[in-house]
């Protein structure tokens, strides 16, 4: 009774998609960290079938199904979904485990069903069955929190709409010097909807439910901080609430703050001021401007002025719909095997994007960082110098964006030779694509330096696997050529590789391989 191969089935969920494994009733959100799908083997007449726990994914969500194999040696695989075969490219991780992945992006009802992965390894043949259920996103929602002013109070109410109903918390940081990282010592959390303390350095409201966590930061201009080198910009969509806070500290109470939009003072009732004394007896004032539902005419430069500080401005732009701006042109890179390299995309977007990097049916977490010029950047460095096509995919509520990258890894040629009754042929991989020379070895040329100018036919490369370019060159033999030693050489910028062939041989009979760097 043959031992069953050790395999692990894993679900990787991508930001805010509400996918989960297990019973349909227990929807969970796994943010980027792999979730074990508990593959259990069922022996069948046609071989072993491993069945993974059912995967639940919200419509428009993105997931990766992954199988990790501890079995050593070569393996080949094939994905089958609704009787269609899909490409499969296994790779090996640092622990030498075989990894097979299938990325399913932007899931729709048509992508629900059974995904079969057929695996052939040296040890055994077997099948892994994944069942993917898609649930209507109408049932599961998590909207980004927004702010409202409390009736008759100078306080902020945090509202988040969602199903199941989200829990709301305020995350406050009052430190200029210390870290405002979520788990840092300067951070205070308040699990309540109303906030009266509005003097902190950083104020954000976060909402959480089964779909994940969304946060909104209170946009702030601090008159005691030097202005940024580029004007801060705030994007909003028509109908969204605008909240913009101006904060200033002075040695005494003898100063005031005002908000202006395009040099016109804001109307009464669209702002409120609060002040307090700090521990060192200096006065902190804040002035909060708000519009409960913005329209196009709320666009413009909002300037906060103080009688004791230089004024500062922010540009508020009101949009009909969200956007993702980035250059979508395909990019191609060629690097040496030892070079360190990252793919990167600079973009401007509103609302914030959800993104993923994809390579060979596998998807990878996407980090993004807002730069000070209003752009954000996402970089992907974990490609392990594997040649191929890489995809950056981003989406928000209103827009989608895809950018393709090609990575080529320079590689020295490696020649394989073959001789038949009528011809000698050599093939080689390597990048850039190798060029060929054929040389004759004779009494006159014992070092095989005499070039063969005629009868050579070079075939254009074809790709076995992405990035593995294969080029071949064939020498047609005349009767006079029989009994000769010939040498074929493939060369590119990384080096040269040669094979010597005895032309009398009917079958494959290369007997010398030269590698010249």
């Amino acid at each position: 009774n043959q031992d069953l191969p050790v395999i692990k089935c894993v679900l990787i969920s991508h930001e805010n998609n509400g996918s989960s494994a297990g019973k349909p009733s227990s929807y969970r959100m796994v943010r980027g960290s792999p979730e074990d799908l508990q593959c259990t083997p069922r022996r069948q007449s046609e071989g072993t079938v491993y069945e993974a726990a059912t995967v639940e994914v919200a419509e428009s969500g993105s997931i990766t199904l992954q199988v990790q194999l501890a079995t050593p040696g070569d393996l080949s695989c094939l994905w089958v979904f609704k009787h269609s075969s899909l490409g499969c490219q296994p790779h090996f991780d640092l622990q030498n485990r075989g990894i097979v992945s299938m990325a399913i992006l932007n899931v729709t009802e048509t992508q629900a069903g059974e995904y079969l992965l057929h695996i052939q390894s040296e040890a055994a043949n077997y099948t892994v069955l994944f069942t993917v259920n898609v649930r209507d996103t109408q049932l599961y929602v998590l909207r980004r929190p927004y702010f409202r002013k409390m009736e008759n109070q100078d306080a902020l109410l945090c509202i988040s709409e969602g199903v199941p109903e989200p829990t709301v918390e305020w995350v406050l940081c009052s430190s200029h010097r210390e870290s405002c990282k979520e788990e840092g010592p300067a951070v205070v959390r308040k699990e309540e909807k109303v906030l009266h303390e509005l003097f902190g350095t950083d104020i954000r409201c976060c909402a959480r439910n089964a779909l994940g966590r969304e946060s909104t930061k209170l946009f702030t201009i601090d008159l005691n901080q030097a202005p940024q080198s580029t004007l801060p910009q705030l994007f909003l969509k028509v109908g969204e609430p605008l909240w913009i806070r101006c904060k200033a500290i002075h040695v005494n109470h003898g100063f005031g703050l005002t908000w202006e939009l395009e040099d016109k003072a804001l109307e009464e009732g669209s702002y409120f001021e609060m002040s307090t004394y700090s521990t060192n007896r200096t006065m902190i004032r804040i002035l909060l401007a708000f519009v409960s539902s913005v329209g196009r005419n709320d666009t413009g430069y909002y300037t906060c002025s103080s009688s004791k500080h230089p004024s500062q401005s922010a540009l508020v732009t009101i949009l009909e719909k969200g956007f993702i701006n980035a250059t979508s042109s395909q990019e191609e890179y060629e690097i040496d095997p030892y070079e360190k390299f990252c793919f990167s995309v600079r973009f401007k977007a509103y609302p914030r994007i959800r993104c993923t990097w994809i390579f060979s049916q596998a998807s990878f977490p996407c980090e993004q960082r807002g730069l000070e010029d209003g752009y954000s950047i996402s970089k992907f460095c974990d490609h392990k110098n594997k040649p191929g096509e890489y995809i950056f995919y981003a989406e928000n509520d209103d827009a989608q964006f895809t950018k393709m990258f090609t990575l080529n890894i320079r590689k020295k040629p490696q020649v394989l030779a073959n001789a038949s009754a009528s011809q000698a042929s050599c093939s080689s991989d390597g990048y850039p694509l190798p060029s060929w020379t054929w040389k004759k070895c004779s009494d006159k040329s014992p070092n095989c330096t005499e070039e063969i100018p005629e009868g050579v036919w070079n075939k254009k490369a074809n790709r076995k696997v992405f990035g593995q370019w294969v080029s071949s060159s064939t020498l047609n033999m005349s009767e006079a050529g029989k009994g000769l030693l010939v040498k074929c050489c493939a060369y590119n910028s990384m080096g040269t590789s040669c094979e010597t062939i005895f032309l009398n041989s009917p079958g494959p009979f290369p007997f010398i391989q030269d590698n010249i760097s």
Partner: antibody
């Protein structure tokens, strides 16, 4: 072995000119952005200028803009800094440095290979 | 353009942990990828941390970096006499297309 070797430093009078060179070896020079960084005696590091791998993008510190010109010759694996209208405050050790990543957006990565520096003294 | 502020000097006994901070004069340093360099007297700088918290090959695990909110930090655990050097933080200012270095921190191992 990856190496950078600066040359061209020396003593020059205020208002004079000097051209620094940085010879690169052991890597695909055209794949990397390069920078010049200087350090005045007893002071900290100050970035001077940077250039993209193809030579198409150039960047300058405000203190040298209009006086210094960065360039590169990828066929010779060499980086240059042409320094005109030199001032006493330009006196420093000048290092050339390579970006950590090939084909990098400057927003990340830093500089992982540095030369040993060439000393520029501006004095009358 | 913003500046990066570092403490002028820090000192610690061998075997202890030392931290060096780097703060932006305006805006949040969290919008930058931060690099840290070590420079010993008479030598060129050496990159010890890049992209906030990654270490180049050959740099001991004792060197670690973090970046959150208002401050980036270089932490050196189990400090050794050989760690005595000047340390500089560095970021790219994408609004002015400039590299910016901090003023440097002299680490003395007591």
């Amino acid at each position: 072995e990856v190496q950078l070797l600066e040359s061209g430093g020396g003593l020059v009078q205020p208002g004079g000119s000097l051209r620094l060179s940085c010879a690169a070896s052991g890597f695909t020079f055209s794949s990397y952005a390069m920078s010049w960084v200087r350090q005045a005696p007893g002071k900290g590091l100050e970035w001077v200028s940077a250039i993209g791998g193809s030579g198409g993008s150039t960047y300058y510190a405000d203190s040298v803009k209009g006086r210094f010109t960065i360039s590169r010759d990828n066929s010779k694996n060499t980086l240059y800094l042409q320094m005109n209208s030199l001032r006493a405050e330009d006196t420093a050790m000048y290092y050339c440095a390579r970006d950590y990543y090939a084909f990098s957006d400057p927003a990340y990565g830093g500089m992982d290979v540095w030369g040993q520096g060439t000393l520029v003294t501006v004095s009358s | 353009n913003f500046m990066l502020t570092q403490p002028h000097s820090v000192s610690e006994s061998p075997g202890k942990t030392v931290t060096i901070s780097c703060t932006r004069s305006s805006g949040s340093i969290a919008s930058n990828y931060v690099q840290w360099y070590q420079q010993k007297p008479g030598q060129a700088p050496v990159l010890v941390v890049y992209d906030d918290s990654d270490r180049p090959s050959g740099i001991p695990e004792r060197f670690s970096g973090s970046n959150s909110g208002n401050t980036a930090t270089l932490t050196i655990s189990r400090v050794e006499a050989g760690d005595e050097a000047d340390y500089y933080c560095q970021v790219w200012d994408s609004s002015s297309d400039h590299w910016v270095f901090g003023g440097g921190t002299k680490l003395t191992v007591l």
